[in-house]
Structure formats: structure tokens, C-alpha cells
């Protein structure tokens, strides 16, 4: 599931350190016992470099082989490099693992650009900075790939955290998280705090930067402020949600809400950008341009191609509007909104200009496969993937990048009627889920 702007992604650390995080308001929802609290050993277990993905350290095999694995909520295979590749410093050596079992089955995953293929097997897997368990999981040992691994990204595999329906070669291949929950007492929930850089990092800073947290089995209070608002998972394949309204600086785009979810809307940590269906993208860009009309930017900037630079520290955040997505709430006719700042949707790009400049790419782009709420959205929020209750929660991230005038927000409730009509029903064909790559 990795393409064009699907991967690579971006990361980095910004915002207050743990000790300076704002106190969280009392949550208005009761939670099941054991599902929230402190997960100290998992905090700050993600790293990454700008535009190249958030990864977690995992071990596979016996004795354990350590690999960095990209966290991807937009796919469902656990796949790791298993053969030499110019961009890999290390790879999974099955022959060295006494616990490897060959499934005698191949897997081929093509994308719009590029592909990977490999051999299926199972082995023992653990997450050093995660729950203290070891599980036997399916592993796709990648033996051949094209435009999949990224030079210098520092990850050697991908952890698909979505549902079995989109697993390759078919839905009978149990995804890692399903195996984890089945084989342990870990609750069926995980949460992600992706911490964007917010400013261009030089090579040294980028390599050393902390990227965020993947909390397995629950919710960590310290990672968010305010309350969590939940939206239903519409269907368990991707993490599909329903957007019911879109605003730019409070101005409604006034489109038929079906357009926002054509042909789906998903939450995907493996995509860099906020990707919008063509009609929605065009309307949003028109509105963003109008809101920032005191300055004009080149056409290529709005296409996500050209970079715009300002003298270091002078980026005019105030001229760019906030973007609000209203998501279906858990209560009938109720929605809530998540609001991101230009600090999220203008992506800092490192190593292109002089140290005198801060340069950015516009990280909202056009999609032919629906809305993708990628890192641009996720970096503003603590996102809870509550699989047990078939819902996704959003709260303001304690590490999101903001300024003294505006902050990312999660607000509600709002009255919104006929939200069910906003979902798009994909015509069922044999190939309805075959296009993994999102161009």
C-alpha cells in the first residue's frame, strides 16, 4: 500500500516534552477497565525521518532479529525485507531462525507504481518497546521489490494494522494485530501519536528525532489534551470513517457529503498527505487560495510539487486557513469536528535550501480512491483505533505543532442530520478491493 505520496511519510518530534504537557480535561466517557492509564514503556517508541515513515522496532525469529518496521494503518500484511537490497542495512534471515515455518505460499502486491513480492511463513514476533509478549504471526518475507523500500528511511518492513479483508493474498491471512489479540490478553485496541517536525530538520536532527508513540492495548493519558471524540468504523477493512462536512477557516465547502467519502474515507498512517477526492480537492484548494489571497503561490505548489520558502522563522502561518473535517459521531444526528493548522498541512522539507530558509510542500493532494487522512491529519491528534468497539477516537495531540494564536482542535457535538447518506456504497465486483496502491 505504498505509493506516490502513500509512502514515504514524515515524522520528527516537536511540541512540549512530556513534563510540559498540558493537563487533560476530565474525559466525559467511561472506559472499560484496564484500557487506559500509563503505558510508559511504549511512549516515544516510534521514530522516523521527514517524509519517510514512522517505524517501530520489532524482533522476529529465534534468536531474535531486530528490524525497524513502518507502522501502516492502511494495509494488513506484516511484510519484511528478507533478501539483500541496496536500501536495506539489514533484513530478515529466515534460515537463521529456528522458529520459522514456511507456509509454502507466495504473495504478490502490486501498487500503482512499484510492487513487492515474497514468500509467506510464520515466526515468533515481539515489540521490545511494546507489550511484554511474543506471538506467532504471519510474515511475508519480501524477496523482490520495486520502489517500495526508501533509501535512508531506516525501516526494513511494514506492519499493516488494518483488517483481514484487505490482507494479501486474501482475507484468510491473519493480520499481526489479530494474532496478537488472539494469543494474549491484550485488549483489542491501539493508539497512535504521530509527532510531526513542524520545521525542517537537518540530517543529524532527523536521524536522532523521536517520532511519537504506538500504544498497544490501550490509551495513554499523557499523550493528549481535552477529551476523546469517537467516530464509528464504517466497515472493517481499511479503517473507514464517514466525513459529513468540510470547512476551510469556518467556511463550509457546501458539497454533497457523499463527495467527501467517494469512494471511501480512511485513516492511514502510511500516507503522508491529506488526500481528497478530485472534486473536493479542487474546491478545498480554491478555498485555501482565497483565504490566503494576500500572497500568491506557484501552481506547482498547490500540486504538491514546488516548495515555497521563507526566511527561517518567518513562515506566515497566519495567512493560511485552518481545515476542519466533521466526522460522524457515535450518537444519532451528532457529529464532531477535527481542525488542523497549516503547521500540519504545510510539510517542512529538509536539506533543500540554505539554513536561512524554511521550505514547505503543500501536503493536501488529489486522490482517485477517496479521502485519506494521512499523517497531515494524524500529526494533529492522538488517534485511538478502538477495534473492540468498532470506533476511532480523536483528541488533540500533546505534541502537535502550533503557534501562539491557533491550536489543532477536536470539538463537538454538532447536530448533523442524515449522516448515513454521506457514505458511498462501492459497487461489489470481484476486483473491488484489488487496487491497493493509492495514486
Amino acid at each position: 500500500t505504498h505509493l506516490g505520496i502513500r509512502l514515504p511519510l514524515r515524522s520528527g518530534l516537536a511540541g512540549p516534552p512530556l513534563g510540559l504537557r498540558l493537563p487533560r480535561e476530565t474525559d466525559e466517557e467511561s472506559e472499560e477497565p484496564g484500557r487506559r492509564g500509563s503505558f510508559v514503556e511504549m511512549v516515544d517508541n516510534l521514530r522516523g525521518k521527514s517524509g519517510q515513515g514512522y517505524y517501530v522496532e520489532m524482533t522476529v525469529g529465534s534468536p531474535p532479529q531486530t528490524l525497524n518496521i513502518l507502522v501502516d494503518t492502511g494495509s494488513s500484511n506484516f511484510a519484511v525485507g528478507a533478501a539483500p537490497h541496496p536500501f536495506l542495512h539489514r533484513y530478515y534471515q529466515r534460515q537463521l531462525s529456528s522458529t520459522y515455518r514456511d507456509l509454502r505460499k507466495g504473495v504478490y502486491v502490486p501498487y500503482t507504481q512499484g510492487k513487492w513480492e515474497g514468500e509467506l511463513g510464520t515466526d515468533l514476533v515481539s515489540i521490545p518497546h511494546g507489550p511484554n509478549v511474543t506471538v506467532r504471526a504471519n510474515i511475508a518475507a519480501i524477496t523482490e521489490s520495486d520502489k517500495f523500500f526508501i533509501n535512508g528511511s531506516n525501516w526494513e518492513g511494514i506492519l499493516g494494522l488494518a483488517y483481514a479483508e484487505i490482507a494479501r493474498p486474501d482475507d484468510s491471512l491473519e493480520p499481526f494485530f489479530d494474532s496478537l489479540v488472539k494469543q494474549t490478553h491484550i485488549p483489542n485496541i491501539f493508539s497512535l501519536q504521530l509527532c510531526g517536525a513542524g520545521f525542517p530538520l537537518n540530517q543529524t536532527e532527523a536521524l536522532a528525532s523521536v517520532g511519537g508513540s504506538m500504544i498497544i492495548g490501550g490509551i495513554d493519558h499523557s499523550l493528549y489534551t481535552g477529551r476523546l471524540w469517537y467516530t464509528p468504523i464504517r466497515r472493517e477493512w481499511y479503517y473507514e470513517v464517514i466525513i459529513v462536512r468540510v470547512e476551510i477557516n469556518g467556511q463550509d465547502l457546501k458539497m454533497d457529503c457523499k463527495e467527501y467519502n467517494y469512494d471511501k474515507s480512511i485513516v492511514d498512517s502510511g500516507t503522508t498527505n491529506l488526500r481528497l477526492p478530485k472534486k473536493v480537492f479542487e474546491a478545498a484548494v480554491k478555498s485555501i487560495k482565497a483565504a490566503s489571497s494576500t500572497e500568491k503561490f506557484p501552481d506547482g505548489f498547490w500540486l504538491g510539487e514546488q516548495l515555497v520558502c521563507w526566511q527561517a522563522g518567518t513562515t506566515p502561518w497566519n495567512i493560511f486557513p485552518v481545515i476542519s473535517l466533521y466526522l460522524m459521531g457515535e450518537v444519532t444526528n451528532q457529529s464532531f469536528r477535527i481542525t488542523i493548522l497549516p503547521q500540519q498541512y504545510l510539510r517542512p522539507v529538509e536539506d533543500v535550501a540554505t539554513s536561512q530558509d524554511d521550505c514547505y510542500k503543500f501536503a493536501v493532494s488529489q486522490s482517485s480512491t477517496g479521502t485519506v487522512m494521512g499523517a497531515v491529519i494524524m500529526e494533529g491528534f492522538y488517534v485511538v483505533f478502538d477495534r473492540a468497539r468498532k470506533r476511532i477516537g480523536f483528541a488533540v495531540s500533546a505534541c502537535h505543532v502550533h503557534d501562539e494564536f491557533r491550536t489543532a482542535a477536536v470539538e463537538g457535538p454538532f447536530v448533523t442530520a442524515d449522516m448515513e447518506d454521506c457514505g458511498y456504497n462501492i459497487p461489489q465486483t470481484d476486483e473491488s478491493t484489488l487496487m491497493t496502491g493509492r495514486a
Epitope: S293, D299, Q306
Partner: antibody, heavy 120, light 108 residues
């Protein structure tokens, strides 16, 4: 058709401020399709971008010159201007004004240029 | 900073010959590159934008190619008025700031 014409003193003393004006004729400087810019070329050397301005007054400057440069626009006169302070002999150059078109990216129309010599 | 290196510095050719000028960027600039022609005592003139698109009024003998880091300006058959200095410029980083050092095409 649209034309650009630079004007200003050809000789400036060291430490003083160089001031040039570019007059746009045959079209409006208030067009939303263009930025307007200044580029200079020291004798026998290459081109150096100085800065751009939009009719709203929004400016971008070359970081290496930013502390000394001011570009302004006067839409009523269809003109934009360059001021470069604390000049030295190294600022001796032909100064061009130009229009930044093709999606605000390329200098598609240039003035003829004016030579400014910095000397006492 | 993105540095543009033009080669050769000087190209000595006769009218009717083919001229091939090179511009190399220190890192990828996608296809956001222009070529300008400057004759003695005149202002530069935009020839090519977005690496391969001819500007208005530019003869078909001028063509641009390349993307990423390597770009070429080709003059298929040199006319007497083509002897000039040619500059490349990247606009991948905006506002456009970086010009190459120039290639002088002179009569052999």
C-alpha cells in the same frame, strides 16, 4: 503589449541607498496572474535574483540581500520600486525588472536593464 | 542550497551545427527548470520553461529535455542570432532564486 522600463540614478556613492523604479506600461501591475521582480547582473557575471513583489504588497527577498533590500509597489502609478541600502562596489551591476509569469514561476518578460555604478 | 552547474562554460560552434548545453542540479528539481538566452547588451529572454515547454515566440529549433538533476537545452541548427549566453534557472524552490553560471555559445 506590456513593457517594463527601469529608471533611477546610474551612479550611487558607497554606503548610500540605491533606488530604482520599474514602470509597467501596456497592462496592469494589479493583475492577479503575476509577481514582479528585480534581478541584477554584475559586469561580465551571471544573474542574481534580488526579490519579488505581488500587487498586494507581499514580498520575497533573496536571503543574502534581505537585510538591505526593500521592494514596494504603487498600483496607482503602475510601478514597483527597489531600494538597496549601504551599497558597496560589489553592488555595481545592471539591474533588471521582470515579470514573474507561468504560474508565478518564470521571468517571462524583462525590462532592458539599467547600469548602476557604485563609486565615490 | 540547490546549485546549478552549467557545462561547458563555452561552446564554439559554426552556424548550422547542433548545440547541446547541459545544466546539472545538485539535487532534484523535478521539471521546474527554465532556460534563458542573453545577447550582449540585452536583457535575458525566456526560452524554455518547465524543462521542455517553449515560451511564446521561441523557434522550434530550441528544445529542452530532462528532469530531476540533469537537463539539456538543444539548438538543432544554430542560426547566427543564436550566438549568446544561455542560463538555466530552477524554480523547484520558490520564489525562484537560483541561476546557473551560464554557457557562452560562440562562433567557431
Amino acid at each position: 503589449q506590456l513593457q517594463l522600463q527601469e529608471s533611477g540614478p546610474g551612479l550611487v556613492k558607497p554606503s548610500e541607498t540605491l533606488s530604482l523604479t520599474c514602470t509597467v506600461s501596456g497592462g496592469s501591475i494589479s493583475s492577479s496572474s503575476y509577481y514582479w521582480g528585480w534581478i541584477r547582473q554584475p559586469p561580465g557575471k551571471g544573474l542574481e535574483w534580488i526579490g519579488n513583489i505581488y500587487y498586494s504588497g507581499s514580498t520575497y527577498y533573496n536571503p543574502s540581500l534581505k537585510s538591505r533590500v526593500t521592494i514596494s509597489v504603487d498600483t496607482s502609478k503602475n510601478q514597483f520600486s527597489l531600494k538597496l541600502s549601504s551599497v558597496t562596489a560589489a553592488d555595481t551591476a545592471v539591474y533588471y525588472c521582470a515579470r514573474l509569469g507561468h504560474g508565478y514561476s518564470y521571468f517571462d518578460l524583462w525590462g532592458r536593464g539599467t547600469l548602476v555604478t557604485v563609486s565615490s | 542550497e540547490i546549485v546549478l552547474t552549467q557545462s561547458p562554460a563555452t561552446l564554439s560552434l559554426s552556424p548550422g551545427e547542433r548545440a547541446t548545453l547541459s545544466c546539472r542540479a545538485s539535487q532534484s528539481v523535478s521539471s521546474y527548470l527554465a532556460w534563458y538566452q542573453q545577447k550582449p547588451g540585452q536583457a535575458p529572454r525566456l526560452l524554455i520553461y518547465d524543462a521542455s515547454n517553449r515560451a511564446t515566440g521561441i523557434p522550434a529549433r530550441f528544445s529542452g529535455s530532462g528532469s530531476g538533476t540533469d537537463f539539456t537545452l538543444t539548438i538543432s541548427s544554430l542560426e547566427p542570432e543564436d550566438f549568446a549566453v544561455y542560463y538555466c534557472q530552477q524554480v523547484y524552490l520558490w520564489p525562484p532564486r537560483t541561476f546557473g553560471g551560464g554557457t557562452k555559445v560562440e562562433i567557431k
